[in-house]
């Protein structure tokens, strides 16, 4: 038998530092989580302990923080080469600065392989991008050979900005060929490793035939085998066992989210290459692990220019740009069309000549908008004023919802109208009139929403049994403020944009902003 | 586009020496672990050398060691394999490869992209 220790992450968006328990900006530092410097240590720890290790992460290291922001992608390459990384699949966040984006700091840049068998590049970005991405990787490991292969989410078109040359193909039926392809040369020993969520992880596991374990992202899954350490709620035991279809169990495995977890698990694998056992749980990398002082000295040096950056202009407002909770809790406030705005934009996707964009509304709690911004300041906004709206490192993103969700969202937003509380909703591509005469849960009385599939926008009546895409916060994806109904009957969540980010470039594109109070948001008493 | 070109091949006699070069465009060299691996007709492909992209350290076949020498010049973009003693089994087309990581290998499966080869012949 031989042993192989795997150790993975995912979904790190951005979380160089260490950060607090929910993975937002650490304050107190005995109590704060993850972090390169943590994760180099515990890496370097298993490392010297056991023979054959391989670190893996399976994608969306871009965007969550001003790192990305600032660095772009350099950051990621710098730090994943620093902990040496063996292999590492594109999610669809490293898409969001375009492919230019991609490669010139990351897919240059990193000195390990990184991987999709799924995405197909054409015409003149073909050569271009050529060897930059591999469809499948094999490693050497001891005395071993070990096949990685690589997918990314289809969905990755709508999720971000992977341009009109890369063709995003349906991961089974990428992945069996290049699967096929290892065999052939004889390496009997392999992983998938990828971006497309838990449920598509478990299919690949069931369907690819060849897949000895699954090392998935993009969903956040938290998976752990007994009493679990932190505040996350498992979704199964690690590793997951999933029954292929060829009747061998294989081990599917991910590990939360923002570095948080080190995914730890250790397969046994016969002279054959056939699984005979798995076993590990995700290491909680909290501050009984140390950093390592040279990782968190190359942190702090690269710091700096952060600090520098949150107080240089963005844009500038020739209005009050007014977040106050007076307002945004009450009534339409600019702020909050502002940040709707800010979040159509950022999710414009012409895949489609029927639609002008694949989405056209957004709804926001009010509760989430905790600062103004004057504009007596000679107008100027910098990050560090959109920080002070938006403190809590929160993402922008995409859901399908029916829209008898959003007509009881809407419901929500005014059921305990007049108490100042944060679920009143701010939005974008939808007109709203509520009848607070009327008893809670019967107050909304017109809902009319932006037509997608029209050359011309306009607005036309919710209908109930209609599938829509919405741009929400991920507190309301979850179900905050109360918001049960979002979370309990979605039909499709995607994590977007750090929430600031969006913002910022959107002030930075437009480079002058004046957002008006609109009549988005109406009330009126009597006959309707 | 990421190329490979070996050159330096050539008709030698036994006991004689030969410098292969191996010149990369289209991606940074000293971001890749290099291997130099040999083709006699009829025979299984064979891993000759390889020299890591992270310390530098070098690897060789137990037939070549202490014969040939693996080095490599990043800011020209070019790794070298220094052969001297040539024997007649020497003789077979020489290709060099690359592959980014941290591990170096002489198992030509690791190895992502590769050169047309040059022939090298030992003969009197």
């Known amino acids: 038998a031989w042993e192989l220790t795997i150790l993975h992450t995912n979904d790190v968006h951005s979380r160089l530092e260490q950060t607090s328990e929910d993975s937002s900006k650490c304050v107190n530092a005995s109590r704060c989580m993850g972090g390169v410097a943590r994760l180099f240590t515990k890496v370097q720890q298993i490392r010297r302990a056991e023979p054959n290790v391989l670190l893996l992460d399976a994608g969306d290291q871009y965007q969550g923080t001003i790192w990305f922001t600032v660095y772009k992608g350099a950051e990621v390459a710098h730090f994943m080469n620093a902990l040496r990384y063996d292999a590492m699949a594109l999610g669809n966040h490293e898409f969001d600065n375009g492919v230019e984006g991609l490669i010139e700091p990351l897919l240059k840049e990193a000195k390990f392989p990184i991987l999709s068998a799924n995405i197909k590049a054409k015409g003149p970005l073909a050569s271009q991008i050529s060897g930059l991405y591999l469809p499948y990787k094999v490693l050497p490991v001891g005395d071993e050979v070990v096949g990685i292969v690589g997918y990314t989410s289809k969905e990755t078109p709508f999720l971000s900005n992977p341009g009109t040359n890369l063709v995003f193909e349906d991961e089974i039926t990428a992945l069996q060929p290049e699967v096929d392809k290892l065999k052939t040369l004889n390496v009997n020993k392999i992983i998938a490793l990828g971006h497309s969520g838990f449920e598509m992880d478990k299919l690949i596991a069931q369907k690819v035939r060849g897949v000895d374990v699954v090392v998935g992202g993009h969903s956040n899954t938290f998976l752990y085998t007994g009493n679990p350490p932190s505040k996350e709620v498992p979704a199964g035991k690690y590793p997951f066992i999933v029954t292929s279809d060829d009747g061998r169990k294989v081990p599917v495995v991910q590990a939360y989210a923002f570095g948080k977890y080190l995914g730890y698990l250790k397969i046994e694998f016969d002279e054959r290459g056939n699984v005979i056992s798995s076993h590990g749980n995700p290491i909680l990398l909290n501050s009984s692990i140390p950093e390592d002082p040279s990782i968190k000295a190359d942190i702090n040096k690269w710091r700096i220019k952060l600090d520098n950056y949150s107080t240089q202009e963005l844009g500038k407002t020739i209005v009050y740009l007014d977040g106050s909770s007076q307002s945004c809790r009450f009534r339409e406030c600019n702020m909050g069309n502002l940040i709707c705005d800010a979040m159509i934009n950022n999710n414009l996707r012409h895949t489609d000549e029927m639609f002008w964009n694949h989405v056209s509304m957004c709804i926001l709690n009010g509760g989430g908008i905790r600062s103004p911004i004057d504009e007596r300041n000679n107008g100027t906004i910098t990050w560090e004023n959109l920080a002070a709206v938006l403190p809590f490192g929160g993402t922008f993103d995409l859901v399908q919802l029916k829209g008898s969700t959003l007509k009881k969202a809407f419901e929500h937003s005014v059921h305990r109208y007049g108490q100042s509380t944060g679920e009143f909703l701010q939005v974008g591509g939808i007109h709203v009139v509520y009848d607070l005469s009327r008893k809670p849960g019967d107050r909304v009385v017109k809902l009319d929403v932006l037509c997608t599939k029209c050359r011309v926008p306009s607005y036309d009546p919710l209908k109930m049994d209609e599938v829509y895409k919405v741009i929400l916060p991920n507190f309301l994806a979850n179900g905050g403020d109360g918001f049960q109904m979002i979370k309990d009957e979605l039909l499709r969540h995607d994590s977007g944009d750090q929430d600031i980010n969006v913002v910022s470039t959107y002030i930075s594109k437009m480079k002058v902003i004046y957002p008006a109070v609109e009549g988005r948001i109406k009330f009126s008493t009597g006959s309707h | 586009q990421v190329q490979l070109v070996e050159s330096g091949g050539g008709l030698v006699q036994p006991g004689g020496s030969l410098r292969l070069s191996c010149a990369a465009s289209?991606?940074?060299?000293?971001?890749?672990?290099i291997g130099w691996f040999r083709q006699a007709p009829g025979k299984e492909r064979e891993g000759v050398s390889c020299i890591s992209n992270s310390d530098g350290s070098t690897y060789y076949a137990d037939s070549v060691k202490g014969r040939f020498t693996i080095s490599r010049d990043n800011a020209k973009n070019t790794v070298y394999l220094q052969m001297n003693s040539l024997k007649p089994e020497d003789t077979a087309v020489y290709y060099c490869?690359?592959?980014?990581?941290?591990?170096?290998?002489?198992?030509?499966?690791?190895?992502?992209?590769w050169g047309q080869g040059t022939q090298v012949t030992v003969s009197s």
């Open positions: 490869a690359a592959y980014r990581g941290w591990h170096p290998s002489l198992d030509a499966r690791v190895y992502d992209y």
């Open positions: 289209g991606f940074t060299l000293d971001y890749y672990n």
